[in-house]
């Protein structure tokens, strides 16, 4: 999906007001400094294409987040405010249902949230481009 | 400390597909980082080609994009290229490289294709 | 597409004299900017990010400066390992990440 034509601050204001509390809740107990972030975003549509992927795409050791209030959210803001989004999402939608049965919190997990969290924010930073 | 090592042939036929792989040591690709490649024609500047990250997003180069892929072994803990259709304007040294999704951390020593017949 | 053009194309300096590169770059790219080492049969080395932070175990000796379309690496005082060519590169327009044509550093 091309999130080029995304209402940006719209989704910003989904960000500050619920998924990054909700991304604070999930890493409740972390310290801030416990994991690196290796991995970062250039403009608008880069920084959603990688939180997309990173939010929704099981990874090694972590293949429990779609489920996450987090995760939700984001999926409802990329719907709502991406043109298109929704009719791109219905096959790993049904993919997801399958694949993921219950949420379980692992350390690789928390550090998945953690590049999250630095994806988020490199979003929202005032200077960065729209695309 | 990691380390990245290009290898594949050196000699690719016009209208050819050029395969590379890239072995990494001391670090696991789907732990961390994207996974880039990048090349430099003998004699001229650097040019990227694309990345996928840790967790298997991938992005290329418009100007390369309909050639491209860039896949991952990660039993290996290696990466590959592969660009078709290659013409004499795709010899180049290919290095592979560690990034941030930005700017390239780490880089393999380079490996050199040259496309002829 | 961001065009990346630097200069001087060649800089000959001695060991010990300071060196000024400058990278300019088509459009404002703020502060999303690389610079690189590549010294003759090797890859490049990552010297600076986000325009003006060293990367690990750069010497001090190096540092960056500018943003939006301006940009300058320097070299405050050239050691013999430091003749070199050096890229820019912007990694503000993604995908469309570009680099520098580079500027080589020779001994005069």
């Known amino acids: 999906y091309d999130f080029t034509n995304c209402d940006f601050e719209k989704i910003k204001a989904a960000y500050l007001s619920t998924i990054s509390k909700d991304l604070i809740t999930y890493m409740s107990g972390t310290k801030s400094t416990e994991f690196n972030n290796t991995v970062s975003c250039s403009n608008r549509p880069h920084c959603l294409t990688e939180i997309q992927s990173l939010t929704f795409n099981p990874t090694a050791g972590c293949a429990s987040l779609a489920k996450e209030m987090f995760a939700m959210k984001t999926k409802a803001a990329l719907a709502i405010w991406c043109p298109g989004y929704s009719e791109t999402q219905i096959n790993a939608t049904q993919a997801m249902k399958k694949a993921r049965k219950s949420k379980v919190t692992t350390n690789k997990c928390l550090e998945q949230v953690s590049q999250l969290q630095g994806l988020w924010r490199r979003f929202n930073r005032p200077l960065l481009k729209q695309q | 400390q990691v380390q990245l090592q290009e290898s594949g042939p050196g000699l690719v036929k016009p209208s050819e597909t050029l395969s590379l792989t890239c072995a990494v040591s001391?670090?696991?690709?789907?732990?961390?980082?994207?996974w880039s490649w990048i090349r430099q024609p003998p004699g001229k500047g650097l040019e990227w080609i694309g990345y996928?990250?840790?967790?298997?997003?991938?992005s290329y180069n418009p100007s390369l994009k309909s050639r491209v892929t860039i896949s991952r072994d990660t039993s290996k803990n290696q990466f590959s290229l592969k660009l078709s259709s290659v013409t004499a304007a795709d010899t180049a040294v290919y290095y592979c490289?560690?990034?941030?999704?930005?700017?390239?951390?780490?880089w393999g020593q380079g490996t050199l294709v040259t496309v002829s017949s | 597409e961001i065009v990346m053009t630097q200069s001087p194309a060649t800089l000959s300096l001695s060991p010990g004299e300071r060196a000024t590169l400058s990278c300019r770059a088509s459009?404002?790219?703020?502060?999303?900017l690389a610079w690189y080492q590549q010294k003759p049969g090797q890859a490049p080395r990552l010297l600076i990010y986000d325009a003006s932070s060293r990367a690990t175990g750069i010497p001090a000796r190096f540092s960056g400066s500018g943003s939006g379309t301006d940009f300058t690496l320097t070299i405050s005082s050239l050691e013999p390992e430091d003749f070199a060519v050096y890229y820019c590169?912007?990694?503000?327009?993604?995908?469309?990440?570009?680099f520098g044509q580079g500027t080589k550093v020779e001994i005069k």
């Open positions: 996928f990250s840790y967790y298997g997003s991938t």
């Open positions: 590169q912007q990694y503000s327009n993604w995908p469309q990440y570009s």
């Open positions: 459009q404002s790219v703020s502060s999303n």
């Open positions: 490289a560690r990034t941030n999704l930005l700017y390239f951390d780490s």
């Open positions: 001391g670090y696991s690709i789907s732990s961390g980082y994207g």
